[in-house]
């Protein structure tokens, strides 16, 4: 058993029929010595008396809030949560696994630039009695500060396998980020999730360089070229990208896309912010960006219509 | 010093070589999405001791403008280190790699960039030298991946430095 926050305790349980329950001794935080009684949120009936109450936590029915009283006055409260371990693996019932690799990923994080600011998100099918808190640091053994804001429920609903999921996001900022340095310690993100009386935690470990995903290029424009089916397509670096661009350079890929998003032509990739391409009527030109020197994620596409 | 007295670094050549290095290091070990290579005790011997480009090394745009020598010396140290690693038993031992494959080309290009930074007769002190390599082929494979991932991060910073130097500091 360990303390998650003041008066909130997590009981780690081996979730197996043959496993014994966990013995928990609750102490009433009071100078009083006599006439102390205990009740639980489950029951107003007296569960015991004295300064301590020894309970067995084996099921969710044993978790919850335990309160000690004297003469009708509440002296202190202890909330017990359960963290299940099944076959040696901590439960992951609250969040939806995001199937995008061989590893089990529950938290996804992205950064728009090298400033040390990043956003993480996760999915859950649960809509009530849910609480999240996020902690982050650079490195584990000698952690350096990363500050995370409040967790927010996104307006976006994500549909996976014919089921709706809610998307939660959090933004974090490294305290003393150094955009030009080579990262040696990863950022660690820990999300504590509580659903009713179930506690779970989820972690993600990454270098900012690996989660970079630039915003799409901006100000995408077409300029017809005289006596030619070609056009000059030009764009700009996204406003959110790190500066100076001579140092934090992007590379761009351009693609012509036919009607109904069909017949995607070969991609043309350039380091400049313009290119000559063939532009058929009813087609679209789209451009995406990626860090020029490190193969992180491509941005989403920015597109412009040929007509 | 990085280059003979009185002459400025060959930023444009450095830009071309470092960008080529970026291409090669990613073809030697393509992006793998979310893959956590296990961090074991003893990793430290070869991948934690790499000379990384850190915040105080002057490799940021302002630091390069003030005095690019600090940064170039740091890049040089890294190049020497990785060059030795790529020439060591970790990469030459079993399972063997094609001599003209991406790792072989990478090794040659590291040498090219290092020589650009340190022409014959001009010597910088080099700090670390890689430790002995593991004996098991599977350990070697894992270590290769870790070294290449670390090199990807290193050459990205080096390429930014040369690109910025070429754009803003070359005569």
């Amino acid at each position: 058993i360990w303390e998650l926050e003041k008066d909130v305790y997590v009981v780690e349980l081996d979730w197996h029929p043959d496993a014994p329950g966990e013995m928990v001794v609750l102490t009433c935080h009071t100078p009083e010595e006599d006439d102390i009684t205990w009740t639980s949120a489950q029951s107003s009936e007296v569960l015991g008396s004295g300064k301590t109450l020894t309970i067995q936590v084996k099921e969710f029915g044993d978790a919850g809030q335990y309160t000690c009283h004297k003469g009708g006055k509440v002296l202190s409260r202890s909330l017990l949560l359960i963290h299940k371990k099944e076959d040696g693996i901590w439960s992951t019932d609250i969040l939806k696994e995001q199937k995008e690799s061989k590893n089990k990923i529950f938290l996804k994080c992205e950064a728009k630039n090298y400033s040390g600011r990043f956003t993480c998100w996760w999915l859950t099918a649960i809509s009530t009695d849910l609480k999240f808190s996020v902690k982050s640091s650079r490195g584990f053994s000698d952690p350096q500060g990363v500050t995370c804001g409040a967790v927010t429920l996104s307006a976006e609903r994500v549909r996976v396998d014919n089921r709706d999921y809610k998307k939660y996001t959090v933004e974090c900022q490294e305290g003393s980020a150094c955009p030009s340095a080579e990262e040696s310690l990863p950022i660690e993100v820990v999300v504590d999730a509580i659903h009713k009386l179930k506690y779970e935690n989820y972690t993600s470990s990454f270098f900012i360089r690996d989660i970079i995903k630039p915003d799409p290029p901006t100000n995408l424009q077409l300029k017809p070229l005289k006596n030619s089916r070609h056009v000059e397509v030009s764009w700009e670096y996204p406003d959110t990208w790190s500066t100076p661009h001579s140092y934090f350079s992007l590379t761009f890929c351009i693609q012509a896309q036919g009607k109904n998003n069909r017949e995607k032509k070969d991609r043309l990739c350039v380091d400049k912010t313009s290119a000559k391409v063939v532009c058929h009527k009813d087609a679209k030109i789209r451009v995406q960006a990626r860090d020029r020197y490190y193969s992180s994620s491509w941005s989403d596409w920015a597109s412009v219509s040929c007509s | 010093r990085a280059v003979p007295e009185g002459s400025s670094p060959a930023w444009i050549q450095g830009q071309q070589l470092s960008q080529k290095l970026c291409t090669l290091v990613w073809s030697a070990h393509p992006p793998m999405g979310h893959v956590d290579l296990p961090r074991e005790e003893g990793d430290g011997e070869t991948t934690s001791d790499v000379p990384r480009i850190q915040c105080g090394d002057g490799c940021d745009p302002q630091g390069l403008k003030d005095n690019s020598q600090f940064c170039l010396q740091r890049i040089h140290q890294g190049l020497v280190f990785y060059e030795k690693l790529l020439g060591s038993d970790i990469f030459t031992g079993e399972p063997s790699l094609l001599p003209d494959g991406p790792v072989g080309q990478l090794h040659a290009n590291l040498l090219g960039l290092r020589q650009l930074l340190q022409p014959e007769g001009h010597h910088w002190e080099t700090e670390q030298t890689p430790s002995p390599s593991p004996s098991q082929p599977w350990q070697r494979l894992l270590l290769r991946l870790k070294i290449l991932r670390s090199l990807q991060a290193f050459v990205a910073v080096a390429a930014r430095v040369f690109a910025h130097g070429a754009a803003t500091l070359s005569p």
Partner: antibody
Framework: EVQLVQSGAEVKKPGASVKVSCKGS????????LGWVRQAPGAGLDWMGI????????RYSPSFQGQVTMSVDTSTSTAYMELSSLRAGDIAVYYC????????????WGQGTLVTVSS | DIVMTQTPLSLSVSPGEPASISCRAS??????LAWYQQKAEKAPKSLIY???SLQSGVPDRFSGSGSGTDFTLRIGRVEAEDAGIYYC?????????FGQGTRLEVR
């Protein structure tokens, strides 16, 4: 006052099923797990299993697994225990009992339901 | 399954005399043991839980002790109404199991 009131005695043919009910009152029904105990004539007590009324989480005894089904209707504060493939060896009094939170014992018991199996 | 063994299987005590029943578990169960009393044709009634805690409303002539594998139920001064069968039950590991019962006769 805490009360667990069980349904009346049943007589069933071999191979049939029986469903015994247990209605809880005088306490918050959904927050206490409920269990079932069997007592054959002149014999001791046999723990059959327990279930959570809030989410129907169930722990069956291996001796009864496959033959017994526990269920609950929270709208009427009633728990059910269904025993299938009845045979003479299932003749017994079946008790429902309330599990004490923070412990695992039964602090209140129903009056019992006698199930007789006879052709 | 954990086997609970009670001794003796029956005892006869005069009113005002003490009585004691033992219960042994086939493996350690910490202090997760309960005692129940069952009178003829009635449902069992909880007496003691957590090896030594008295259930609310139970006379204090009843007491329990022990931990691990060996437990005892004591009745300080037996009264006529204490006649019945007494069962111990472990609730440490599923399936929770009962002892075979001890019949107490009050002479």
């Amino acid at each position: 006052e805490v009360q667990l009131v069980q349904s009346g005695a049943e007589v069933k043919k071999p191979g049939a099923s029986v469903k015994v009910s247990c209605k809880g009152s005088g306490y918050s029904f959904t927050t206490y797990w409920l269990g079932w105990v069997r007592q054959a004539p002149g014999a001791g007590l046999d723990w059959m299993g327990i279930m959570s009324p809030v989410d129907s989480d169930i722990r069956y005894s291996p001796s009864f697994q496959g033959q017994v089904t526990m269920s609950v209707d929270t709208s009427t504060s009633t728990a059910y225990m269904e025993l299938s493939s009845l045979r003479a060896g299932d003749i017994a009094v079946y008790y429902c009992a309330r599990r004490r939170p923070g412990q695992g014992y039964f602090d209140f018991w129903g009056q019992g339901t006698l199930v007789t199996v006879s052709s | 399954d954990i086997v609970m063994t009670q001794t003796p299987l029956s005892l006869s005590v005069s009113p005002g005399e003490p009585a004691s029943i033992s219960c042994r578990a086939s493996q350690g169960i910490s202090s997760w043991l309960a005692w129940y009393q069952q009178k003829a044709e009635k449902a069992p009634k909880s007496l003691i839980y957590a090896a030594s805690s008295l259930q609310s409303g139970v006379p204090d002539r009843f007491s329990g002790s022990g931990s691990g594998t060996d437990f005892t139920l004591r009745i300080g001064r037996v009264e006529a109404e204490d006649a019945g069968i007494y069962y111990c039950q472990q609730y440490n590991i599923y399936p929770y199991t009962f002892g075979q019962g001890t019949r107490l006769e009050v002479r």
